[in-house]
């Protein structure tokens, strides 16, 4: 239904608190360099305006679109060109081009300092003084660093944050209460960010059809008892929600997500038997819970997939009559039977099936041609299964840090031109897949591993797009989203790479490394490891292990020494010499 005032409609639907939070997220994701205070001022102005429209929908400007209202606010910011350069040119355009222009200027890797968590006492003091401002800062800091973060989900994480602070700030030992809990939220939020970025990439690069296919596969796995019509309705709604969020329409996105959650809870009987616990929760928790609800029990009497999609003489006729519906049905039927497959794998199988029908249905005897299609799926299924086994075995043998290092060596060899910080970030993230997925039951490993790796590799592609340096990476990133992970896995040592010359200063360390937190120490060591591989791309695992063990021993010795500075300055050059010899 059309509303006289869109802004009044959204304010009424969402309520003041969520409305303000979403507007703050929107502004922070568009203008990532502005301070919290600048954005908070704009949010208050927009909220006051929304209230006037609620009071009188016919008031001046209340009929304007949200893009027009928000865009006008952003374009009125003083010193826009000085702070944002060519983004200011967006303000010369009319809607909808202006909003598209803002979207194109979102920076996936903004040059902002890492978000440092204040110490417990300070955090609790400012939280108690003004919880609203404190949470506003959280939304602002996360949103500007993650310009595609799923806005309604960020409100959920802010709510989690709030609950943790409320609980822990009342404890005697605030630090030990806060640290593990906030670390848990941070980890989940970071994973949520890369997953959502992948969805937006899918939408931006391949359109709604590609995202809808992803949604059909995912929903069919989770709700195997829902019929195809129900899955299609949910996938269509979910596509709309994600399109809105990826497009910066955060108020509509959050509103439609709430509607979708409501619909699911009102129609549990035709969707899944597992929704009740989620549906008993308040809005943000409910929507979050539904998004990661456990798979329903698969129907016991499902016929073999071959009956309708291989053995039936009508396959090509059905395909001709409604290609997308027939392929959608195939994806639905295959996915509901395979909660143990990754969505990426299911989409590759559907693509293979489509290609087979395209080829076979044009032949004089199609059934003879497509009759072997399911057998042709086998190598596509085996490849990720082997990947999971090999990598989980390696993780179990080396632990997370050692596994990250193995991945770092592998990926530096595949794409040595990529900057060391990007390689280290990617390897650390890829390496976390072990901790995240390899401990799960066998039937959950493959979907966890592959879909997580795909999301991380999407980030690698986004960073590489800004400054393309590796033909290997460009090749894998320019293909379809579902083929990226197999493409990266298949890459070998880049033979075109001219090794970096050995620079002693790259491997020179000082006593300040001793006081760094463990994570920062690991990053320093991993930076050195990547640089070693860039110097000697064909170094054996044994050679690299020797050097890294020597390096670890050197750090341990010097950090325990009475005179650390002297130890570093005398033993450091010896270490460099030994490294050069070991790799000669």
């Amino acid at each position: 239904e059309a509303h006289k005032s869109e802004i009044a409609h959204r304010y009424n639907d969402l309520g003041e608190q969520h409305f303000k939070g979403l507007v703050l997220i929107a502004f922070s994701q568009y203008l990532q360099k502005c301070s919290y205070d600048e954005h908070a001022k704009l949010v208050q102005e927009v909220t006051d305006f929304a209230k006037t429209c609620v009071a009188d929908e016919s008031a001046a400007n209340c009929d304007k679109s949200l893009h027009t209202l928000f865009g006008d606010k952003l374009c009125a910011i003083p010193n826009l060109r000085e702070n944002y350069g060519e983004l200011a040119d967006c303000c010369t355009k009319q809607e909808p081009e202006r909003n598209e222009c803002f979207l194109q200027h979102k920076d996936d890797n903004p040059s902002l300092p890492p978000f440092e968590r204040p110490e417990a006492e300070a955090m609790c003091t400012s939280f108690k003084e003004n919880p609203t401002t404190f949470m506003g800062h959280y939304l602002h800091e996360v949103a500007r660093r993650h310009p595609y973060f799923y806005a309604p989900e960020l409100l959920y994480y802010a709510e989690q944050y709030n609950e943790i602070l409320t609980q822990c700030c009342a404890e005697a030992d605030k630090e030990s209460c806060l640290t593990p809990k906030l670390d848990g939220v941070k980890e989940k939020a970071l994973v949520s960010s890369v997953r959502q970025r992948m969805k937006c990439s899918s939408m931006q690069k391949f359109g709604e059809r590609a995202f809808k296919a992803w949604a059909v596969a995912r929903l069919s796995q989770t709700f195997p008892n829902a019929d195809f019509a129900e899955i299609t309705k949910l996938a269509t709604d979910l596509t709309k929600v994600n399109k809105e969020c990826c497009h910066g329409d955060l108020l509509e996105c959050a509103d439609d997500r709430a509607e979708l959650a409501k619909y699911m809870c009102e129609n549990q009987a035709t969707i899944s038997s597992k929704l009740q616990t989620c549906c008993d929760k308040p809005l943000l928790k409910k929507a979050h819970c539904l998004s990661e609800v456990e798979h329903d029990t698969m129907p016991a009497d499902l016929p073999a997939i071959a009956a309708d999609f291989v053995e039936d003489q009508e396959v090509c006729k059905n395909y001709a009559e409604a290609k997308d519906v027939f392929l959608g049905t195939f994806l639905y039927e295959y996915s509901r039977r395979h909660p143990d497959y990754s969505v990426s794998l299911l989409l590759r199988l559907a693509k293979k099936y489509e290609a087979t029908l395209e080829k076979c249905c044009a032949e004089a005897n199609p059934p003879a041609c497509y009759g072997t299609v399911l057998a042709e799926f086998q190598p596509l299924v085996e490849e990720p299964k082997n990947l999971v086994k090999t990598n989980c075995d390696l993780y179990e043998k080396l632990g997370e840090y050692g596994f990250q290092n193995a991945i770092l060596v592998r990926y530096t060899q595949k794409a040595p031109q990529v900057s060391t910080p990007t390689l280290v970030e990617a390897a650390r993230n890829l390496g976390r897949v072990g901790t995240k997925c390899c401990t799960l039951p066998e039937d959950q490993r493959l979907p966890c591993v592959e879909d997580y790796l795909s999301a991380i590799l999407n980030r690698v592609c986004l960073l590489h797009e800004k400054t393309p340096v590796s033909e290997h990476v460009t090749k894998c990133c320019s293909g379809s989203l579902v083929e990226r992970r197999p493409c990266f896995s298949a890459l070998t040592v880049d033979e075109t790479y001219v090794p970096k010359e050995f620079k002693a200063e790259t491997f020179t360390f000082h006593s300040d490394i001793c006081t760094l937190p463990e994570k920062e120490k690991q990053i320093k060591k991993q930076t050195a490891l990547a640089e070693l591989v860039k110097h000697k791309p064909k170094a054996t695992a044994e050679q690299l292990k020797t050097v890294m063990d020597d390096f670890a021993q050197f750090l341990d010795t010097c950090c325990k020494a009475a005179d650390k500075d002297t130890c570093f300055s005398t033993e450091g050059p010896n270490l460099v010499t030994r490294c050069k010899d070991a790799l000669a």
């Epitope: 249905c361 044009a362 032949e363 005897n365």
Partner: nanobody, 115 residues
Framework: KVQLVESGGGLVQPGGSLRLSCAAS????????MTWVRQAPGKGLEWVSS????????LYADSVRGRFTISRDNSKNTLYLQMNSLRPEDTAVYYC????????SSQGTLVTVSS
Amino acid sequence: KVQLVESGGGLVQPGGSLRLSCAASGFTFSSFGMTWVRQAPGKGLEWVSSISGSGSDTLYADSVRGRFTISRDNSKNTLYLQMNSLRPEDTAVYYCTIGGSLSPSSQGTLVTVSS
């Protein structure tokens, strides 16, 4: 909406000829192999002939090989069946179908071979 409309049937004497046509719409005709099937009075469906999307490959049932010729004109979205040396046992309703389908969804065209 996929539509297949057969025409060209009629009464013909044994040894005579007929040319059946099938006008197709609602799908990418050239991307699909096509088939002629027939159903004699009181009998089940019988496959007659098939042709690939490009028209380069053709297949025939033993009972019609050497007498019937399947062809297509992709520019006109039309399938043909040239039937020569017709016999009384060729009497049937003839249907065109998509791919290897043996269950028609069209009206068909009646061919009667009788003296």
